[in-house]
Interface confidence: medium
């Protein structure tokens, strides 16, 4: 399987909410001994490899934000985590895997990485990640929304 990032750039005004998304592509083994570890973290564009450094998102580590479940199963982190830190990670039946960040501030700007690890109890392992940039802009009216785009494309859409 692979991980796709539908959008590589999200531009949002302060105070808005944004949902960053990764998508699991390709065949996913649904065997009883196969599970998936999915998580999010902040990183930097390393010279050698993007996403190799793992930093917390709003003081929550990748361990705090992880989901662990089988195949294309729905899962999400609990609401008390979302309420306390304005974060919620979720995974649906279609391979979409997201983190929602509420009430954005300028400090939320940066590179975000999703990580998916296929666990087969050590008979094999497969690990993939995706990266996307979040730019939070000051002074925009509260009515404006986030824009999501691929940096290389001129097209952009309004993000949910």
């Amino acid at each position: 399987f692979k991980v796709a990032t539908p959008y590589s750039l999200y531009v949002c005004p302060e105070g808005q909410n944004v949902t960053l998304t990764c998508r699991l592509l390709g065949p996913v083994d649904k065997g009883h001994d196969v599970t998936f570890y999915k998580t999010w973290y902040r990183s930097s564009r390393g010279e050698v490899q993007t996403c190799s450094e793992r930093r917390p998102i709003r003081n929550l580590t990748f361990q705090d934000l992880h989901l662990h479940h089988g195949g294309h199963q729905a899962a999400n982190t609990s609401h008390d985590l979302a309420q306390r830190h304005g974060l919620e990670s979720a995974s649906d039946h279609h391979g979409n895997f997201s983190i929602t960040m509420r009430n954005l501030t300028l400090l939320d700007s940066g590179l975000y990485c999703c990580l998916v690890v296929e666990i087969r109890h050590h008979h094999s392992e497969h690990r993939v990640h995706g990266a996307m940039e979040l730019q939070v802009q000051a002074g925009k009216g509260s009515g404006s929304t986030c824009m999501a785009s691929n940096e290389q494309d001129s097209d952009s859409i309004t993000a949910a």
Epitope: S52, H68, A75, T77, S78, L81, H122, E125
Partner: antibody, heavy 120, light 112 residues
């Protein structure tokens, strides 16, 4: 057979540093976090931290930050822990232990332990 | 850090008896994703710890079914239905819901 082979006992003087090794065999070394655990006098266990051998990413118990440094050599499937500025408090048995499920924190394979003795 | 408190410290039993070890955490071990990362290990004299039970009640492969784990939130129990000689040693509970991972102080299972 999955094994973690640890280096032999160490006798060090106070203030010195020591580097102990843990060689993995029988499985994909980069597939799971490698953890290090300290045991004093055969009593309680303390988690020092872990390292993701794939990325080299480390997570430390705050208590051991500045004391322990975790590294890996992927080419030889070996994890290392360096302990610096040794004192008698560091005399203990140190275990490496593999995470059973990547990074979920339960350890199915343990090394035999390396005894570190700090004495002048 | 999460403090794990095990009781009793020492548990004298007769072979064939049932044994029960309690582990209490200073805060809930329910992870935000709904899982509870509470585990049990057995360390025999002169050996490394061995994983018995993971995530409260899942027996690790090769562990006899006389071992069972239960509990939720902050209170957990390991039961051995019929103690055999090979079960003697020190039992540790451990949590990996919160970093740093922490262990209980151990319960020594010994012959009466």
């Amino acid at each position: 057979e999955v094994q973690l082979q640890q280096s032999g006992p160490e006798l060090e003087k106070p203030g010195a540093s020591v580097k102990i090794s843990c060689k993995a065999s029988g499985y994909s070394f980069t597939g799971s976090n490698m953890n290090w655990v300290k045991q004093n006098n055969g009593k309680s266990l303390e988690w020092i931290g872990n390292i993701d051998p794939y990325y080299g990413y480390t997570t430390y118990n705050q208590k051991f930050k500045g004391k322990a440094t975790l590294t890996v050599d992927k080419s030889s499937s070996t994890a290392y822990m360096q302990l610096k500025s040794l004192t008698s408090e560091d005399s203990a048995v140190y275990y490496c232990a593999r995470d059973y499920d990547y990074a979920l924190g339960y350890f199915d394979v343990w090394g035999a332990g390396t005894t570190v003795t700090v004495s002048s | 850090d999460v403090v794990m408190t095990q009781t009793p410290l020492s548990l004298p039993v007769s072979l064939g008896d049932q044994a029960s070890i309690s582990c209490r955490s200073s805060q809930s071990l329910v992870h935000s994703n709904g899982n509870t990362y509470l585990h049990w290990y057995l360390q025999k004299p002169g050996q490394s710890p061995k994983l018995l039970i993971y995530k409260v009640s899942n027996r690790f492969s090769g562990v006899p079914d006389r071992f069972s784990g239960s509990g939720s939130g902050t209170d957990f129990t390991l039961k051995i239905s019929r103690v055999e000689a090979e079960d003697l040693g020190v039992y540790f509970c451990s949590q990996s819901t919160h970093v740093p991972y922490t262990f209980g102080g151990g319960t020594k299972l010994e012959i009466k």
